[in-house]
């Protein structure tokens, strides 16, 4: 599922870029894609450790 077209608005009024769960916003293609395509943090089993700042997945980012 993709985001609908933005409404026209001024340059100083940024439009939101929401993504559905399990999708993340790709800054280069400028639309939502499956998070797995973007090397996003992956949820891990309880007790697993990681060297990266792996917070809860935030698909809208």
């Amino acid at each position: 599922m993709r985001r609908g077209p933005r409404s026209l608005r001024g340059r100083d009024a940024p439009a939101p870029t929401p993504c559905v769960p399990a999708e993340c916003f790709d800054l280069l293609v400028r639309h939502c894609v499956a998070c797995g395509l973007l090397r996003t943090p992956r949820p891990k089993p309880a007790g697993a450790s990681s060297p990266a700042p792996r917070t809860a997945l935030q698909p809208q980012e």
Epitope: P14, L38, E61
Partner: antibody, heavy 118, light 113 residues
Framework: EVQLVESGGGLVQPGGSLRLSCAAS????????WNWVRQAPGKGLEWVGN???????YYNPSLKSRFTISRDTSKNTFYLQMNSLRAEDTAVYYC????????????WGQGTLVTVSS | DIQMTQSPSSLSASVGDRVTITCRSS???????????LHWYQQKPGKAPKLLIY???NRFSGVPSRFSGSGSGTDFTLTISSLQPEDFATYYC??????????FGQGTKVEIK
């Protein structure tokens, strides 16, 4: 843990060509964006370009006509083909992975030196 | 392209000093999704850069608490609250909001006084 290893640097004459390689381990290059960043001696960092999970490429506009990024997914390796090299292309070339949630360069290779000189 | 301007270009400081580096962008770095993709890297001679701070103020894993980032819009700051011997390096700000291209500041070299 993702690791990147560059190779292919060296001395090349002005007008010549060179291909750099970046071998990735610990992650597949079919996910994410895989970048080249260069640093001229004593200078700052300059983004060269990248190749995406789909094989799409993006370039620094100042370099696009001379530099080409490609990949071989079977080798989990991506490349930087540099043509019509100039003295000002002398730099350490780093490959780097991009975090797709926060959009920072989260993993870097060790760098490979390219010297363009006659 | 977005221009990133750091100041100062270099500074001399002593161990224990508080150090502040500023970074100014030519346009606001607030993305239409509400996020500000401004990051800070540390680089030591002969080594690849390392991420310190992401999205303005978030310390990367393993980065000491003496490093902090702040700012908004076009003006950002990296602060080292108490400079340690291992902190002598060059620091770069970088933006990923308006891409391509990804752009970096020219760097700030922190030297021993």
């Amino acid at each position: 843990e993702v690791q990147l290893v560059e190779s292919g640097g060296g001395l090349v004459q002005p007008g010549g060509s060179l291909r750099l390689s970046c071998a990735a381990s610990g992650d597949s290059i079919t996910s994410g964006y895989w970048n080249w960043v260069r640093q001229a001696p004593g200078k700052g960092l300059e983004w060269v370009g990248n190749i995406s999970y789909s094989g799409s490429t993006y370039y620094n506009p100042s370099l696009k006509s001379r530099f080409t990024i490609s990949r071989d997914t079977s080798k989990n390796t991506f490349y930087l083909q540099m043509n019509s090299l100039r003295a000002e292309d002398t730099a350490v070339y780093y490959c780097a992975g991009l975090d797709g949630l926060y959009w920072y360069f989260d993993v870097w290779g060790q760098g490979t030196l390219v010297t363009v000189s006659s | 392209d977005i221009q990133m301007t750091q100041s100062p270009s270099s500074l001399s400081a002593s161990v224990g000093d508080r150090v502040t580096i500023t970074c100014r962008s030519s346009q606001s770095l607030v993305h239409s999704n509400g996020n500000t993709y401004l990051h800070w890297y540390q680089q030591k001679p002969g080594k690849a850069p390392k991420l310190l701070i992401y999205k303005v103020s978030n310390r990367f894993s393993g980065v000491p608490s003496r490093f902090s980032g702040s700012g908004s819009g076009t003006d950002f700051t990296l602060t080292i609250s108490s400079l340690q011997p291992e902190d002598f390096a060059t620091y770069y700000c970088s933006q990923s909001t308006h891409v391509p291209p990804f752009t970096f500041g020219q760097g700030t070299k922190v030297e021993i006084k």
